[in-house]
Amino acid sequence: FERTRSLQDPCSNCPAGTFCDNNRNQICSPCPPNSFSSAGGQRTCDICRQCKGVFRTRKECSSTSNAECDCTPGFHCLGAGCSMCEQDCKQGQELTKKGCKDCCFGTFNDQKRGICRPWTNCSLDGKSVLVNGTKERDVVCGPSPADLSPGASSVTPPAPAREPGHSPQ
């Protein structure tokens, strides 16, 4: 099949890094500077992506593969192949049209990107709130109130993690 195809179409013999040059009677020509073809049989080479502005180069372009971009610090990628860079916010915030805004009460965001999400409703699972939620953290659900009735084995909540430089209250 390959042999038949190459007899019918001389361009199918052109390897990655080349294009089938109509100006040269369909012989394979290497891609010109700052262009690439990642597969064989191409009739043109594609212009290399340039990572400018808020984009930075993660992988340089070559004659056989496009450049890959990511975002400068303070921004994160969105879209296929990092087609956009979006501003980071702090944990406990979300990005709005007016910039980074704190999560409303009852919601949290534990990442520098994305939206604030509602705290888990422990009672829907018949459980109680063991650790209250914050803007940065979801609530921690504990055993159901019935499990904490007298006689039931009590669960000791984990001690809250101390931050460096803070003495115990």
Partner: nanobody
Framework: AVQLVESGGGLVQPGGSLRLSCAAS????????ISWYRQATGKQRELVAW???????HYVDSAKGRFTISRDNTKKTTYLQMNSLKLEDTAVYYC?????WGQGTQVTVSS
């Protein structure tokens, strides 16, 4: 413009080796991509090996493992080392960069 002159062709037995040279003169700073092509009698000119603009050497399947392309910028020369030559490697070999072509050098593989 760039002028290219090939040399190093000749008659060699199957399994033998040859080293072709392509000397460049003129505005050689224009040379980002340099290629070797060949044309056998009655056939279309075909790409054999090239040094791409990113300075990586590439080969068509028929040349892989047998031919080596290299460049010596101080001598303004590109080489094609051809080992394990076969009868079907018989052709005129041309050096190319952009729109500039050399005059070609004949390689004949014959027993």
């Amino acid at each position: 413009a760039v002028q290219l002159v090939e040399s190093g062709g000749g008659l060699v037995q199957p399994g033998g080796s040859l080293r072709l040279s392509c000397a460049a003169s003129g505005n050689i700073f224009d040379i980002r991509v340099i290629s070797w092509y060949r044309q056998a009698t009655g056939k279309q000119r075909e790409l054999v090996a090239w040094i791409a603009w990113d300075n990586v050497a590439h080969y068509v399947d028929s040349a892989k493992g047998r031919f080596t392309i290299s460049r010596d910028n101080t001598k303004k020369t590109t080489y094609l080392q051809m080992n394990s030559l076969k009868l079907e490697d018989t052709a005129v070999y041309y050096c190319n960069s952009g729109d500039s072509w050399g005059q070609g050098t004949q390689v004949t593989v014959s027993s």
